[in-house]
């Protein structure tokens, strides 16, 4: 029950996280015009990964896409790549984790297969979250660097008289959405990995097996049960049996086609 809850919660948290990463990637407000200590202008500039926008006080908003690929800064391209990789990995992870959910039965899929799929999706979520966090952090670092550079430029001019107001940019809402979403995806991935451990069948003979010996009808019980039977250490009439007899749902998990995603 705890495993199912952990897996389910991990899935939901990752789903929210990936939705957030997609939202952050699409948002226009990665960087916004810094209004602090600036002359009050009637336009508000903000930029995203794909386009830059200007909102005028009169109510008009104009957005222009970055139609060039080669002319864009390498850092921006890197951030785009990280976010897209994060989304792709997250989407594949979600797809895998849906089939891995314990509460969903698909054919005669074994628990070992589900465990492997849960682990795979968990790793994908972790990498997806890290990609998003890395992408947002790289962009934030770029902003901080540019901010201080433009601040220095603001106060250097001919005779100290500033003729052009340098537009400085600060952190936009998308950065915070990205950080939170990346964190959630990461947490979701960790939860999936934890759930995987609980799903994986262990190599212990916990099931009582009935073995009919010739001549006598003796019920053999595996020794693994002795601690919980109430018979103490009285094992005189018991024989630890480790033969090939197994119950139906304790089939040895050999590598199968379901194990590899």
């Amino acid at each position: 029950m705890a495993v199912t809850a952990c897996q389910g919660l991990g899935f939901v948290v990752s789903l929210i996280g990936i939705a957030g990463i997609i939202a952050a990637t699409c948002m226009d407000q990665w960087s916004t015009q810094d209004l602090y200590n600036n002359p009050v202008t009637a336009v508000f500039n903000y930029q995203g990964l794909w386009r830059s926008c200007v909102r005028e006080s009169s109510g008009f908003t104009e957005c222009r896409g970055y139609f060039t690929l080669l002319g864009l800064p390498a850092m921006l391209q890197a951030v785009r790549a990280l976010m897209i990789v994060g989304i792709v990995l997250g989407a594949i992870g979600l797809l895998v984790s849906i089939f891995a959910l314990k509460c969903i039965r698909i054919g005669s899929m074994e628990d070992s297969a589900k465990a492997n799929m849960t682990l795979t999706s968990g790793i994908m979520f972790i990498v997806s979250g890290l990609c998003a966090i890395a992408g947002v952090s790289v962009f934030a670092n770029m902003l901080v660097t540019n901010f201080w550079m433009s601040t220095a430029n603001m106060y250097t001019g001919m005779g100290g008289m500033v003729q052009t107001v340098q537009t400085r940019y600060t952190f936009g809402a998308a950065l915070f959405v990205g950080w939170v979403a990346g964190g959630l995806t990461l947490i979701g991935g960790v939860m999936m990995c934890i759930a995987c451990r609980g799903l994986a069948p262990e190599e212990t003979n916990y099931k009582a097996v009935s073995y009919h010996a010739s001549g006598h009808s003796v019920a053999y019980k595996p020794g693994g049960f002795k601690a919980s039977t109430g018979f103490g250490s009285n094992t005189k009439n018991k024989k630890i049996y480790d033969g090939g007899a197994r119950t139906e749902d304790e089939v040895q998990s050999y590598p199968s086609k379901h194990d590899y995603v």
Partner: antibody, heavy 117, light 113 residues
Framework: QVQLKESGPGLVAPSETLSITCTVS????????VQWVRQPPGKGLEWLGA???????NYNSALMSRLTISKDNSKSQVSLKMSSVTAADTAIYYC???????????WGQGTLVTVSS | DIVMTQSPSSLAVSLGERVTMNCKSS????????????LTWYQQKPGQPPKLLIY???TRESGVPDRFTGSGSGTDFTLTISSVQAEDLAVYYC?????????FGSGTKLEIK
Amino acid sequence: QVQLKESGPGLVAPSETLSITCTVSGFSLTTYGVQWVRQPPGKGLEWLGAIWAGGNTNYNSALMSRLTISKDNSKSQVSLKMSSVTAADTAIYYCAKGGYGNAMDYWGQGTLVTVSS
Amino acid sequence: DIVMTQSPSSLAVSLGERVTMNCKSSQSLLNSGNQKNYLTWYQQKPGQPPKLLIYWASTRESGVPDRFTGSGSGTDFTLTISSVQAEDLAVYYCQNDYFFPFTFGSGTKLEIK
């Protein structure tokens, strides 16, 4: 079509409060801003202030302490209030709709306000 | 506040003549975000409210004849009338639409010789 019409008292006594209403049609005040401009007789244009779609306002720094611009979206009305008027406030008062580039693309005909005792 | 300086204060021209008037702002009106200059030109005829001619320094308002051309960037701007017509006789104002409070130039009066 877009229309703006100013309605004012015509005559205001010195030190009184001047109140002008701008009634708009053909556009919504929740989408576009309205700006106020005045023109003393035989002189140039002076920007007074503006109220934008979101309700935020900006004022002429020299008149800020005396000016209040407000609006009623449901009535499609914008009002300008100027306290402690003097003869120097005698002018034609215009309201205008904000357009591209924060420019004023549609103007009212203006209302002449004379400050005199 | 931004100071808008217009020159000349008045000019007398013959019909069909090309005319140029200038406007200078105390700070750059260029917005780096969209590379547009927030300078507007208005025309005011006697007894009428001002009429929008040009916004973003060079974009003609719809319905404005193409003989009116706005140019310039940063702090220096120009309004050109390629061939003056009788109906162009008016006062022309430039306005800063970038920094609050918005400010007007003192105007250029266009008269017939």
